[in-house]
Amino acid sequence: ITRQSLDPQRRAAPQQKRSSPTEGLCPPGHHISEDSRECISCKYGQDYSTHWNDFLFCLRCTKCDSGEVEVNSCTTTRNTVCQCEEGTFREEDSPEICRKCRTGCPRGMVKVKDCTPWSDIECVHKESGTKHTGEVPAVEKTVTTSPGTPASPCS
């Protein structure tokens, strides 16, 4: 899951690379100065921007929560990618928590798909082959999200 926020407290360090905006916008990996005259590079491993923009501050890199593993570290143009750790998964309709995968199928059913970070195990009836989805307990740790969701995916 990607989480992002603008950080008004952090200003660009003097050694950061600077260039001029194009059509009033700065390229991915940069943000714009308050006077709109310069593009200032984001700080590697600290913040990022994925699109052409006129952000006054780059977006803060996500820190993976406990219960998650970092599969891609943050760069100046891409946010951290966090994944639920083994034995847990994140559903599309409840992305804020990693849920524990079921350990087995109900009686009379057989497992056809293993647990992945994106889905629970999948069980089907032995005879009919019909899918079964069960209630899944939530892991105590929740994944916190910042206010404001990007309209477009920023991975």
């Epitope: 992002q4 194009t22 390229p27 994925t50 923009n53 006129d54 006054l56 990007p150």
Partner: nanobody, 126 residues
């Protein structure tokens, strides 16, 4: 933290006017440009208008050009959208957006935004 608060929505007749306001309650929009998008049920949010808060440059979707006017009051940290000659097809939830994102520098229409307001409903009946 950037927080956008819209107001001014409501129900009007075709041909009427409304003025929407977007205030940055965190004292910063976090970006130079601020825009308005709108969304109708079952459809994606579509860009309506944007303004550069530094120099006042404006950008409009073709569907609202000549009818909607976006403006800003930097002292009040507020962006407005005056909507005139409203049509039933303007009925939507209108969202204020900051941290606009573009695929290319020459693009006039943003592909998305980082920060969104909660939305304000505009209903235009014939």
């Amino acid at each position: 933290e950037v927080q956008l608060v819209e107001s001014g929505g409501g129900s009007v007749q075709a041909g009427d006017s409304l003025r929407l306001s977007c205030a940055a309650s965190g004292r910063t929009f976090g970006s130079i440009r601020v825009g308005w998008f709108r969304q109708t049920p079952g459809k994606e949010r579509e860009f309506v208008a944007a303004i550069n808060r530094n120099d006042g440059t404006t950008y409009y979707a073709d569907s609202v050009k000549g009818r909607f006017t976006i403006s800003r009051d930097n002292a009040k940290n507020t962006v407005y959208m005056q909507m005139a000659s409203l049509k039933p097809e303007d009925t939507a939830v209108y969202y204020c957006a900051a941290g606009l994102q573009y695929n290319r520098s020459a693009d006039r229409v943003p592909v998305g935004a980082v920060y969104w307001g909660q939305g304000t409903q505009v209903t235009v009946s014939s």
